[in-house]
Amino acid sequence: AGVFELQIHSFGPGPGPGAPRSPCSARLPCRLFFRVCLKPGLSEEAAESPCALGAALSARGPVYTEQPGAPAPDLPLPDGLLQVPFRDAWPGTFSFIIETWREELGDQIGGPAWSLLARVAGRRRLAAGGPWARDIQRAGAWELRFSYRARCEPPAVGTACTRLCRPRSAPSRCGPGLRPCAPLEDECEAPLVCRAGCSPEHGFCEQPGECRCLEGWTGPLCTVPVSTSSCLSPRGPSSATTGCLVPGPGPCDGNPCANGGSCSETPRSFECTCPRGFYGLRCEVSGVTCADGPCFNGGLCVGGADPDSAYICHCPPGFQGSNCEKRVDRCSLQPCRNGGLCLDLGHALRCRCRAGFAGPRCEHDLDDCAGRACANGGTCVEGGGAHRCSCALGFGGRDCRERADPCAARPCAHGGRCYAHFSGLVCACAPGYMGARCEFPVHPDGASALPAAPPGLRPGDPQRYL
């Protein structure tokens, strides 16, 4: 366990041209406050993922009123550090988001108004117990200067705050195999007591009483090898003899999420989805109201009407979640019609339309036949974003410009000979066959296999069928 500490040194216009206008004015005095969000690992995730390591808000800074005509100076800052307590090991690598908020103190109906002035983000490596690290980050025309460090809370020590220290039992030296706790030389490293029976070869612990397994091992005491053979249940059957994964305690067993948070397992650990009004890795930070600026990404905070809606964030387009912390995958709603490709550009949605379609959502079916003539009496038929010509007899090709050979497909059956004719084709049938395509055999007794003839027609009269 320990605390991440952030000290803001200055927030003001960055170097170079285009100094920003002061966020406050004589008509609209304001004051600043800051919000920090921490996530473990060198996460590429931006503001929309939860602050799994924790979040903190500064106090409000002094009220500031712009001097007319003066450029924006460094703005007055809140006193003190921003502190983010962490209960587990310090991950060593982390991502941060620092937001600078403005609280306007004019005569707004319904109290002060908050707006996001700047957001900076970064990914850093940091050992707990080390010195303050200094940083400068720019957001548009603004520049934020700050320092940060992670420190362990006694009795934890070490770069990850996982080693424990205890006062020396003997005045001269520490027990066998135990080192002095730098920088607390009068204390000794305490042996970390893992869960009883935890495999010394395949298990380890970062906190007393736990047993975490090295890769390839599983079970409550890390004594069961993980097999790649087929297992019966999602975490494998419980028989240790199979070598399958034993359903030992899952990260969500016993629900580590406080205050009604719901737990979901992640590949590395667990994640708590907190009810409105609660924050933190385990939803342990409570009592959040609009005064704490809980809405991310420029969300507008309004007071809720009951204890379960302590505050309500009205999210700007593209964000959702009770704190506007999730970026909306707007393409998942499949807004592009007619097979268009959806592109979420952050500030806007774009649809890349298939041929034959247009419009912001590819909703317009272009007139495929507009300006496309079919030659030689063919007619244009629209369909599926393309046009095609239905050609008159004797013509073919995309635009009916090619003269078709009606006999090319060998349409005359039973050895009949085909002749091209201005109206199409004519079949000269071989002896014993008749019909427009020589498809009917003529029987020797004069009867034929033709369907029953209409009244007034003799079944054996071939020329009627040419």
Partner: antibody, heavy 117, light 109 residues
Framework: EVQLVETGGGLVQPKGSLKLSCAVS????????MNWVRQAPGKGLEWVAR??????????YYADSVKDRFTISRDDSQSMLYLQMNNLKIEDTAMYYC????????WGQGTLVTVSA | QAVVTQESALTTSPGETVTLTCRSS?????????ANWIQEKPDHLFTGLIG???NRAPGVPARFSGSLIGDKAALTITGAQTEDEAIYFC?????????FGGGTKLTVL
Amino acid sequence: EVQLVETGGGLVQPKGSLKLSCAVSAFTFTTYAMNWVRQAPGKGLEWVARIRNKSNNYATYYADSVKDRFTISRDDSQSMLYLQMNNLKIEDTAMYYCVFYYDYVYWGQGTLVTVSA
Amino acid sequence: QAVVTQESALTTSPGETVTLTCRSSTGAVTTSNYANWIQEKPDHLFTGLIGGTNNRAPGVPARFSGSLIGDKAALTITGAQTEDEAIYFCGLWYHNHLVFGGGTKLTVL
């Protein structure tokens, strides 16, 4: 537009039972706590019961006047809120409203429960 | 159990500003009571006006505003209209229990 439609009211004898239902539409019912509020003829409003959402373990709360007689429940899959009323008394005669608090208060049109011998 | 007290009746004139208040027997009303204001018109027509102390519901005229004045919650109607004549209830949350005031009958003469 959020809609709350109460049904199930009617005339019942003292010590009898009745189950009220409230069908909810146009908002994510599962996310929010829900309430029943009543108004006796010519009287003010009285909060009756509250049920929180799943992430708060469907915790329930009751006014002292109905405790151990009324049971509030919900069916998230159907977006339905219920009030099971047992051992009814004449003073339970009232218009019953399904009420949802979020940024402000949303009301149904109410259903009338009359307890009379 | 907490008791919530409102003025039983108030009278105002069109165009005047009137303030209705809501007192808690347990001490000062705070934002943690999530004060709500509800308007009742004839035929059991209820409208939520204000939630969370000062959050005006959509469609509610801007002349209605909610606030905390001293140790009480307040509903102010700036420039009352004849159609504002109604009964106004305030509700305060005490953790997960809601207590209503007795209602204020507002007459706009």
